[in-house]
């Protein structure tokens, strides 16, 4: 059974992930972002189901494409270089979902824009955090 300290650690990691995703979304939605039109043409894949930490595998598999999209944006829109930002997110996601269990992600048929994709995972983080608090 999860201890209160492990639950607290999970909560903090989810909050960190949530802030990173919100920062990316804010940077993309910046009205000065000249690459937004092109960024919105990138197709992202959404999970059929995202209710547990293991489902973060679906986010992890989209972090490569996410990094490529962020490479299009002006660096001043973000505090970190895309490579460093994605690297940080990968570490958090790996700690949250674990590396031992190999979960195969199932994707929804419909693709999403980067904005829809980020909003989906922001909602996921908020949902899990609310169950922990």
């Amino acid at each position: 059974a999860p201890t209160s300290s492990s639950t607290k650690k999970t909560q903090l990691q989810l909050e960190h992930l949530l802030l990173d995703l919100q920062m990316i979304l804010n940077g993309i939605n910046n009205y000065k972002n000249p690459k937004l039109t092109r960024m919105l043409t990138f197709k992202f894949y959404m999970p059929k189901k995202a209710t547990e930490l293991k489902h973060l595998q679906c986010l992890e598999e989209e972090l490569g494409p996410l990094e490529e999209v962020l490479n299009l944006a002006q660096s001043k829109n973000f505090h970190l270089r895309p490579r460093d930002l994605i690297s940080n997110i990968r570490v958090i996601v790996l700690e949250l979902k674990g590396s031992e269990t190999t979960f195969m992600c199932e994707y929804a048929d419909e693709t999403a824009t980067i904005v829809e994709f980020l909003n989906r995972w922001i909602t996921f983080c908020q949902s899990i955090i609310s169950t922990l608090t």
Partner: antibody
């Protein structure tokens, strides 16, 4: 169906420069990140680098930095790979290949390949 | 750089047999791994992407699996046209790296 057609074989002297082309047909080049991979005779595959033709941003493998230049001409849907200061170890078949984030998940991998260009470096 | 180690270097089997090719990553790469088949004088051909997904037009006898940083390409029943060199590739981070290849030859 997307097709990549590369320029013909080249024979170069050590110290020279070679420039290989890769023409995309069946789609516009700006839909793809154009990558270059090489294969020395009887050896494995080695990633050289890539270009995003839409904004000309490039990424190169450390081994090739300073010697390789990847460019793209969107008006002709053609990518180029130029390798300078050639040495005998650069004798290889050079392939162009693609990645795109606009279509299916499968096309995020090296799904389309050129036929390869043999570059021979010999004195 | 991420190193991919393929084994065995050469695999000698007969048509109809099952082939199991291994690729081990030097660090965690999630499912960012693909498999390619290459025949002499030809460009590589994508077989498997995202560790387990079958590329379009590839026969169902090919399958991919993953356990941690160990990846496996399985050919359930070898056909004569399957004898070739197979490479794994990681897309987790640049520089993208390939395994050294496994040559599948007729016994």
């Amino acid at each position: 169906q997307v097709q990549l057609v590369q320029s013909g074989a080249e024979v170069k002297k050590p110290g020279a420069t070679v420039k290989i082309s890769c023409k995309v047909s069946g789609d516009t080049i700006t839909a793809y990140y154009m990558h270059w991979v090489r294969q020395a005779p009887g050896q494995g595959l080695e990633w050289i680098g890539r270009i995003d033709p839409d904004d000309d941003s490039t990424k190169y493998a450390e081994n090739f930095k300073g010697r390789v230049t990847i460019t793209a001409d969107t008006s002709t849907d053609t990518a180029y790979m130029e390798l300078s200061s050639l040495r005998s170890e650069d004798t290889a078949v050079y392939y162009c290949t693609t990645i795109t984030f606009y279509y299916t998940r499968e096309l995020r991998w090296f799904a389309y390949w050129g036929q390869g260009t043999l570059v021979t470096v010999s004195s | 750089d991420i190193v991919l180690t393929q084994s065995p270097a050469t695999l000698s089997l007969s048509p109809g047999e099952r082939a199991t090719l291994s690729c081990q990553a030097s660090q965690y790469i999630s499912n960012y791994l693909s498999w390619y088949q290459q025949k002499p004088g030809q460009a590589p051909r994508l077989l498997i992407y995202s560790a387990t997904s079958l590329a379009s037009g590839i026969p169902a006898r090919f399958s991919g699996s993953r356990s941690g940083t160990d990846f496996t390409l399985t050919i359930s029943s070898l056909e004569p046209e399957d004898f070739a060199v197979y490479y794994c590739l990681q897309h987790y981070s640049t520089p993208y790296t390939f395994g050294q290849g496994t040559k599948l030859e007729i016994k």
